[in-house]
């Protein structure tokens, strides 16, 4: 199930959206211009993210439109900040057995969550659905981002970063796929799949096994169809 990873190559255009999914709804994590973080039922310009992989499973998450880093305070509140503080704005990424991703602060141990409660991450735990994320490639036309065209300079090492300040166009390493026991239950995110062609739909990423008459591997959360 490698294509569900938020850390994908340039085939996803660099921009992704993190969303929680229950059997009948989904919320996309968005970082507003004022730094407020919440969820929206659909992709928005503020839910378009760049996720940069660092060593040892750490990631840095940036809101492309707000140009703010996703950060966490000591109480577990998440917010967007223009200032990058390594202690508050780096998260440990882990893929659960069910193929969903969780992000937690190595400093404060709280999970990134769209729910209001603050819960610490414990290895082996089953977090609530609003603390488990999937990723979806950006479906919003880039013109909606209305990013000003940077000034042209003589081509240099600095030129690349100025034209792409958030590194959204640079390929990134793939993460380890989820266990095979789950991957057969989950759809890929190819361009012709429902996940790629449902920018505004209600996700039906249920936690119950949709295969008639049986239950899947422990911890797996197979998808039902989109509505």
């Amino acid at each position: 199930y490698p294509n569900a990873s938020p850390l994908l190559g340039s085939s996803w255009g660099g921009l992704i959206h993190l969303y929680t999914a229950t059997a009948r709804n989904s919320y996309h994590l968005q970082i507003h211009k004022n730094g407020h973080v919440d969820g929206a039922p659909h992709q928005t310009i503020y839910s378009a993210l760049m996720i940069r992989s660092e060593d040892a499973g750490f990631v840095v998450i940036t809101g492309v439109m707000s140009r703010r880093y996703l950060c966490m305070d000591f109480r577990g509140n998440i917010f967007g900040s223009h200032y990058f503080d390594p202690e508050n704005c780096r998260f440990q990424h882990q893929t659960l057995e069910n193929g969903y991703d969780v992000y937690h602060s190595p400093q404060y141990h709280f999970l990134v969550s769209l729910g209001r409660a603050k819960r610490a991450f414990l290895p082996g735990m089953n977090p609530p659905p609003y603390s488990q994320f999937l990723s979806r490639r950006n479906e919003i036309p880039l013109i909606h981002f209305n990013t000003p065209i940077p000034r042209r300079h003589t081509r240099s090492a600095e030129d690349d970063s100025e034209r792409d300040p958030l590194n959204v166009l640079k390929p990134r390493a793939r993460m380890t796929p989820a266990p095979a026991s789950c991957s057969q239950e989950l759809p890929s995110a190819e361009d012709n799949s429902p996940m790629a062609s449902d920018p505004l739909g209600v996700v039906r990423g249920g936690r119950v096994n949709t295969h008639a008459g049986g239950t899947g591997p422990e911890g797996c959360r197979p998808f039902a169809k989109f509505i």
Partner: antibody
């Protein structure tokens, strides 16, 4: 402040349809799913369905498949629930409720629908 | 679908009593459980979300606990305005409610 204001009580005959409205205010309408929940007299709460406010996509409890239609009008921040082929067992109070990721945090005042011949 | 059962279905108590209501899920739902209070003729009111988090404005005598399949709502010292029906709801894979527990005056 967040408010969900529902339409008034209705009396319908068996076989007819009823359409209940729920007007939202005090928040960004398109940022929260809306649910419909009903409660028959003296009974518990029964979840009916959910609507995505931006796309209009819906998902209903299996019990109501084919009989319930949920729609929304983003220009007026209003959601609608239409229940068709009414029977006496559909006599209930119908509530709309806002989804806040981890709970239904705001509810409408309820609309009493009476089905009687 | 995940089923929720509540016990007791009704109870009689006096002002000042400690009241405990349990909700059991047919399979694990992590902490994705909500408690509501409903009074006759009124819409349900959110009390507890994420199993144990108190909704803003709700008195601290209400508390929730549990995770996985077993959950508890506790009213530490019952007040006259607490006589009502209490419902649990799961937000894990669907949105179904428990059958309710009616708390009335002894």
């Amino acid at each position: 402040q967040v408010q969900l204001v529902q339409s008034g009580a209705e009396v319908k005959k068996p076989g007819a349809s009823v359409k209940v409205s729920c007007k939202a205010s005090g928040y960004t309408f398109t940022n929260h799913y809306m649910h419909w929940v009903r409660q028959a007299p003296g009974q518990g709460l029964e979840w009916m369905g959910i609507i995505n406010p931006i796309s209009g996509s819906t998902s209903n409890a299996q019990k109501f498949q084919g009989r319930v239609t949920m729609t929304r009008d983003t220009s007026t921040s209003t959601v609608y629930m239409e229940l068709s082929s009414l029977r006496s067992e559909d006599t209930a109070v119908y509530y709309c409720a806002r989804d806040y990721v981890d709970a239904f945090d705001f509810w409408g005042q309820g609309t009493m629908v009476t089905v009687s011949s | 679908a995940i089923q929720l059962t509540q016990s007791p279905s009704s109870l009689s108590a006096s002002v000042g009593d400690r009241v405990t209501i349990t909700c059991r899920a047919s399979q694990g739902i992590s902490s994705a459980l909500v408690w509501y209070q409903q009074k006759p003729g009124k819409a349900p009111k959110l009390l507890i979300y994420d199993a144990s988090s108190l909704e803003s404005g709700v008195p601290s005598r209400f508390s929730g606990s549990g995770s996985g399949t077993d959950f508890t709502l506790t009213i530490s010292s019952l007040q006259p305005e607490d006589f009502a029906t209490y419902y649990c709801q799961q937000m894990y894979d669907d949105f179904n409610f428990g059958p309710g527990t009616k708390v009335d005056i002894k």
